[in-house]
Interface confidence: medium
C-alpha cells in the first residue's frame, strides 16, 4: 500500500540504486517515486552534514523486503516512494528555494523582475529543467535580477550550494503549465535524427511517448515496430534530444514511428503509467514472483499491489494453468521496461499500474516519527 | 479572500466552484474535491437551495470568467447535510456532495488529503485559504481564484474574540491579530489547507466570521478532523470501499 510517513533524524542503510542532489526531501521523494526501482529514500539537508559533497544528497534505495535498517543521523530525512499512492503521484514541484543555488549547465541568462517571472521563463523554455535567480540584494551588482535557465544530464542539479540572495526552483512543465504547447501527432514511417539520450523496449509508440514525456532529457522519440527489418532493433524506443529542441532532420523509414514529448502540453499530461494489456505478447525480465490467478486483469492487479513489480506476463499455456487459474509472472528490470518483447505467445502482458494517479488506493496521512 | 493574491493553474487542484443556475448563473460557494465522486463543502451553502438540479460544480478551473455554456460541469447526485446542522447555529457546518459522474484526476483536478480522525497533535504552521469570494466586506466575487496564507489561532484565543458564540472543539480558527487577511463572502465551503511534511491536508471548511479580515476577529472553520467518522460513513459505497481520500 501507500506509505507516506517521513522519518526524521533517520537514514536508510544500504540498498542504493541512484544518488543525486535535490533541494529538499519532498523533491527527493518525487524522484524516488518516478525511479523504476526506488522504494525508499534518504535525504541529507545542508544542516545535517559537514561533508560538502554530500550536502543536499538524495539517495534512492531498493530492497527485496521493501524495508532497510534505519540508522540515526541528526537532520537526515528518510521515507518511502509514493508508488501506489494514487493522486499524490505527480512530477510537479512548485516550491522556490531561498538562499540556494542549484548548479547545472547555464544556457540562458536574462534580467527579470521577480523569481516567479524567472520560473515562468524556465517553464516556457523547452530545454530548461531548473533555474536560479539572483535577487536585487545579491552581493554582486552586475548579477542582480539575473535569471539563469539550466539543465543537466539527469534533470537534477549537478550541485546545490547555499548562497545568500539567490532563489532556485524547477520548471513547471510537469505541472502542465507550459505555454509552449505540444505536438500530439504521431508520425508513421518517419525516423528522427539527433542525439539518443536513452534506449528502452516498449510494445508500442504510445508507451514510448509516455516514457519520453517523463524522461528529464527526452524531447522527441523514434520507435521501431515489431516488424522492423533488423530483428535486434524491434520494439526499440529511442529517446532523443537536440540543441534546438526539435529534430534537425527526419527520414522516411518504413516500420518506424516518431513523435514528441508531451511535457510541454498545456492543461493535460499523460499519466505516468501504461494501462493497456497486450495479447499474444511476452514481456521478459527478472522474475519477482509467480502466482496462480484467474484472468489477466487479476494478474495486472497483483502486479500493481506488489510494489516492486514493474510488468507482468499472464500465461495461457495448458501446462501453466490449473482449472480456472493460470500463471501470472511478476517481473522487473533495471529501467522499468521489459528486457525483451516476444510475440505470438499464448498469453498477455502489461505494466503495473502503481504510478497511475487515478487510483483510490492512496492514503493521505503523514506520521512523523522522531527517533 | 481579503488580502490575497492570484493563484496559478493547478496550485489548488481540489478547489471547486459551486454555482447556481436559476434565471442567471452565479458562484455561491467553494468546495473541496475529496474523491472521484465526492466534494466536501459547508452545509450553509444549501440554505434555501437544497434542490440538486439547480447546482453546477466546476472543477479544474482558475478563472470564473473563462466559464462559458460549453464548459463542462458536474451535477449533483446527492446532497448530504450533517444531521445536526441548524441554520440558526454555527455548529456542524459541513456537507457532502455526491457527483452524478466520477471525475478523472489531472494536475488541475485532484483531491485533497483528509486529516486523521481527531487530529489534535499536528502543529500546522503553513496554512492557506482559497476562494473566489469577496476581496473586501462590501465587495464582489473575484474572477481569478485567490489564495491567502493565514495562521491558525487557538480555540481559546478564538473564543475570547467571539464572546457571544460558542467556539467548539469541532471548529478551528485562523486569522491575524491585526486583521487584513481572511476569507469572505463567497468563500464559504472552500478549503483551509495546511502543508505538513510536504503534504497538503484539508484542515478546515470556510464557515463564518464577523465581517471579513477585521482586527481580532478570526475566521471560523469547520474542523474536518472532527468529522472523519461522519465523512467515512457517508462516503462508504455499497461494496464497502471508501470512495474518497481516506486517512490511514
Amino acid at each position: 500500500g501507500c506509505l507516506t510517513q517521513l522519518y526524521e533524524n533517520a537514514f536508510f542503510r544500504g540498498g542504493d540504486v541512484a544518488s543525486m542532489y535535490t533541494p529538499n526531501a519532498q523533491y527527493c521523494q518525487m524522484r524516488c517515486t518516478f525511479h523504476p526501482r526506488c522504494l525508499l529514500f534518504s535525504f541529507l539537508p545542508a544542516s545535517s552534514i559537514n561533508d560538502m559533497e554530500k550536502r543536499f544528497g538524495c539517495f534512492l534505495k531498493d530492497s527485496v523486503t521493501g524495508t532497510l535498517p534505519k540508522v540515526h543521523r541528526t537532520g537526515a530525512v528518510s521515507g518511502h516512494s509514493l508508488k501506489q499512492c494514487g493522486h499524490q503521484i505527480s512530477a510537479c514541484h512548485r516550491d522556490i528555494y531561498k538562499g540556494v543555488d542549484m548548479r547545472g549547465v547555464n544556457f540562458n541568462v536574462s534580467k527579470v523582475s521577480s523569481v516567479e517571472e524567472c520560473q515562468k521563463r524556465c517553464t516556457s523554455n523547452i530545454r530548461c529543467q531548473f533555474f536560479s535567480y539572483a535577487t536585487q540584494t545579491f552581493h554582486k551588482a552586475e548579477y542582480r535580477n539575473n535569471c539563469l535557465l539550466k539543465y543537466s544530464p539527469g534533470g537534477t542539479p549537478t550541485a546545490i550550494k547555499v548562497l545568500s540572495n539567490v532563489e532556485s526552483g524547477f520548471s513547471l512543465k510537469p505541472c502542465a503549465l507550459s505555454e509552449i504547447g505540444c505536438h500530439m501527432n504521431i508520425f508513421q514511417h518517419l525516423a528522427f535524427s539527433d542525439v539518443d539520450v536513452a534506449r528502452v523496449l516498449t510494445p508500442d509508440a504510445f508507451v514510448c511517448r509516455t516514457i519520453c514525456t517523463y524522461h528529464p532529457n527526452c524531447l522527441f522519440f523514434t520507435f521501431y515496430t515489431n516488424v522492423w527489418k533488423i530483428e535486434s532493433q524491434r520494439n526499440v524506443c529511442l529517446l532523443k534530444t537536440s540543441e534546438s529542441g526539435t529534430p534537425s532532420s527526419s527520414t522516411p523509414q518504413e516500420n518506424t514511428i516518431s513523435g514528441y514529448s508531451l511535457l510541454t502540453c498545456k492543461r493535460t499530461l499523460p499519466e505516468p503509467c501504461h494501462s493497456k494489456i497486450y495479447p499474444g505478447v511476452d514481456f521478459g525480465g527478472e522474475e519477482l514472483n509467480v502466482t496462480f490467478v484467474k484472468g489477466v486483469n487479476v494478474c495486472q492487479e497483483t502486479c500493481t499491489k506488489m510494489i516492486r513489480c514493474q510488468f507482468f506476463t499472464y500465461s495461457l499455456l495448458p501446462e501453466d494453468c490449473k482449472e480456472e487459474k493460470c500463471k501470472c509472472f511478476l517481473r522487473l528490470s533495471m529501467d522499468g521496461s521489459p528486457t525483451r518483447i516476444a510475440y505470438g505467445t499464448q498469453g498477455s502482458s502489461g505494466y503495473s499500474l502503481r504510478l497511475c494517479n487515478t487510483g483510490d488506493n492512496s492514503v493521505c496521512t503523514t506520521k512523523t516519527s522522531t527517533r | 479572500i481579503v488580502g490575497g493574491t492570484n493563484s496559478s493553474w493547478g496550485e489548488w487542484p481540489w478547489q471547486v466552484s459551486l454555482q447556481v443556475k436559476l434565471t442567471a448563473q452565479r458562484h455561491l460557494c467553494g468546495g473541496s474535491l475529496i474523491g472521484h465522486q465526492w466534494v466536501l463543502t459547508a452545509a450553509h451553502c444549501f440554505d434555501g437551495l437544497p434542490l440538486q438540479d439547480v447546482w453546477r460544480i466546476y472543477s479544474g478551473i482558475l478563472n470564473l470568467s473563462d466559464i462559458t455554456k460549453d464548459t463542462p460541469f458536474s451535477q449533483i447526485k446527492e446532497i448530504i447535510i450533517h444531521q445536526n446542522y441548524k441554520v440558526s447555529e454555527g455548529n456542524h457546518d459541513i456537507a457532502l456532495i455526491k457527483l452524478q459522474a466520477p471525475l478523472n484526476y489531472t494536475e488541475f483536478q485532484k483531491p485533497i488529503c483528509l486529516p486523521s480522525k481527531g487530529d489534535t497533535s499536528t502543529i500546522y504552521t503553513n496554512c492557506w485559504v482559497t476562494g473566489w469570494g469577496f476581496s473586501k466586506e462590501k465587495g464582489e466575487i473575484q474572477n481569478i481564484l485567490q489564495k491567502v496564507n493565514i495562521p491558525l489561532v487557538t480555540n481559546e484565543e478564538c473564543q475570547k474574540r467571539y464572546q457571544d458564540y460558542k467556539i467548539t472543539q469541532r471548529m478551528v480558527c485562523a486569522g491575524y491579530k491585526e486583521g487584513g487577511k481572511d476569507a469572505c463572502k463567497g468563500d464559504s465551503g472552500g478549503p483551509l489547507v495546511c502543508k505538513h511534511n510536504g503534504m497538503w491536508r484539508l484542515v478546515g471548511i470556510t464557515s463564518w466570521g464577523e465581517g471579513c479580515a477585521r482586527r481580532e476577529q478570526p475566521g471560523v472553520y469547520t474542523k474536518v478532523a472532527e468529522y472523519m467518522d461522519w465523512i467515512l460513513e457517508k462516503t462508504q459505497s455499497s461494496d464497502g470501499k471508501a470512495q474518497m481520500q481516506s486517512p490511514a
Epitope: - | C29, A42, H44, F46, D47, G48, V87, K185, S188, S207
Partner: antibody
C-alpha cells in the same frame, strides 16, 4: 442570496380582509423565526407578529391580537399574514423579515423584503 | 412587554459632526439590541446587532455600545449619505422598535 418578496397588499374598506404573502429564498426557511413589521406613512417601525420555525408558536403585538393571523408553509417557503377586521390605523407598508440568529455566515445577507402597501379607507 | 425609548426624536447636524443616539429599554435585554438605518421609501438596513457588532459592509464610522438597558449608536463623522432615520430594536423577548431618530441637515 437571501430574498424576501411580499405581495397581496392593496386598497380595502374598513372591516374588510386581506391576505399578505412573503416568498422566501436563499436560506432554509423552515429553520427560522419569521415576522411581520409595518410602518404607517410618516411613522416609525412597529413589530406586528412573529412565528417560530415549526409554526407551532405564534406571537402578536397587542394592537393586532385577535384580528391578524400569521402562518407559514415550509414546503412552499412562504409566510402569510391573514388580516381581518381591518381599521384605518392598519394602513401601512408591511414588511416581512426574519429573526437573524446564529453565527455571521460567510455568505450574503439581507433580512428585509421591500414591503407591500396596505391602505384601509372607505 | 418591553418598551424601547429612543432619544432625541430629531437631531440636526452637519457633515463631519460626531452624532450620538441613545436607546433605553424598559427592562434588561442583555446585548440583544440592533440598530437600523432607513431612508424614505426603502426597507430598513441593519447597521449593528448584538449591541456593538458592526454588520458586514457597514462603514466603520458607525459604532454601538451598551448592555442591559442603556444603549448608544455613534456616528463618528457624519457623511452626506448618513442623513436618515435610525431605529433601535430589541430581540430579547419578541421584538420591539424604538420610535426612531431622524438625523437631518442643520
Amino acid at each position: 442570496e437571501v430574498q424576501l418578496l411580499e405581495s397581496g397588499g392593496g386598497l380595502v374598506q374598513p372591516g374588510g380582509s386581506l391576505r399578505l404573502s412573503c416568498a422566501a429564498s436563499g436560506f432554509t426557511f423552515s429553520h427560522y423565526i419569521m415576522m411581520w413589521v409595518r410602518q404607517a406613512p410618516g411613522k416609525g417601525l412597529e413589530w406586528v407578529s412573529g412565528i417560530y420555525s415549526s409554526g407551532g408558536i405564534t406571537v402578536y403585538a397587542d394592537s393586532v391580537k385577535g384580528r391578524f393571523t400569521i402562518s407559514r408553509d415550509n414546503s412552499k417557503n412562504t409566510l402569510y399574514l391573514q388580516m381581518n377586521s381591518l381599521r384605518a390605523e392598519d394602513t401601512a407598508v408591511y414588511y416581512c423579515a426574519y429573526q437573524r440568529t446564529g453565527v455571521p455566515r460567510r455568505d450574503s445577507f439581507n433580512i428585509w423584503g421591500q414591503g407591500t402597501m396596505v391602505t384601509v379607507s372607505s | 412587554d418591553i418598551q424601547m425609548t429612543q432619544s432625541p426624536s430629531t437631531l440636526s447636524a452637519s457633515v463631519g459632526d460626531r452624532v450620538t443616539i441613545t436607546c433605553r429599554a424598559s427592562q434588561s435585554i442583555s446585548s440583544w439590541l440592533a440598530w437600523y438605518q432607513q431612508k424614505p421609501g426603502k426597507a430598513p438596513n441593519l447597521l449593528i446587532y448584538k449591541a456593538s457588532t458592526l454588520e458586514s459592509g457597514v462603514p466603520s464610522r458607525f459604532s454601538g455600545s451598551g448592555s442591559g438597558t442603556e444603549f448608544t449608536l455613534t456616528i463618528s463623522s457624519l457623511q452626506p449619505d448618513d442623513f436618515a432615520t435610525y431605529y433601535c430594536q430589541q430581540y430579547n423577548t419578541y421584538w420591539t422598535f424604538g420610535q426612531g431618530t431622524k438625523v437631518e441637515i442643520k
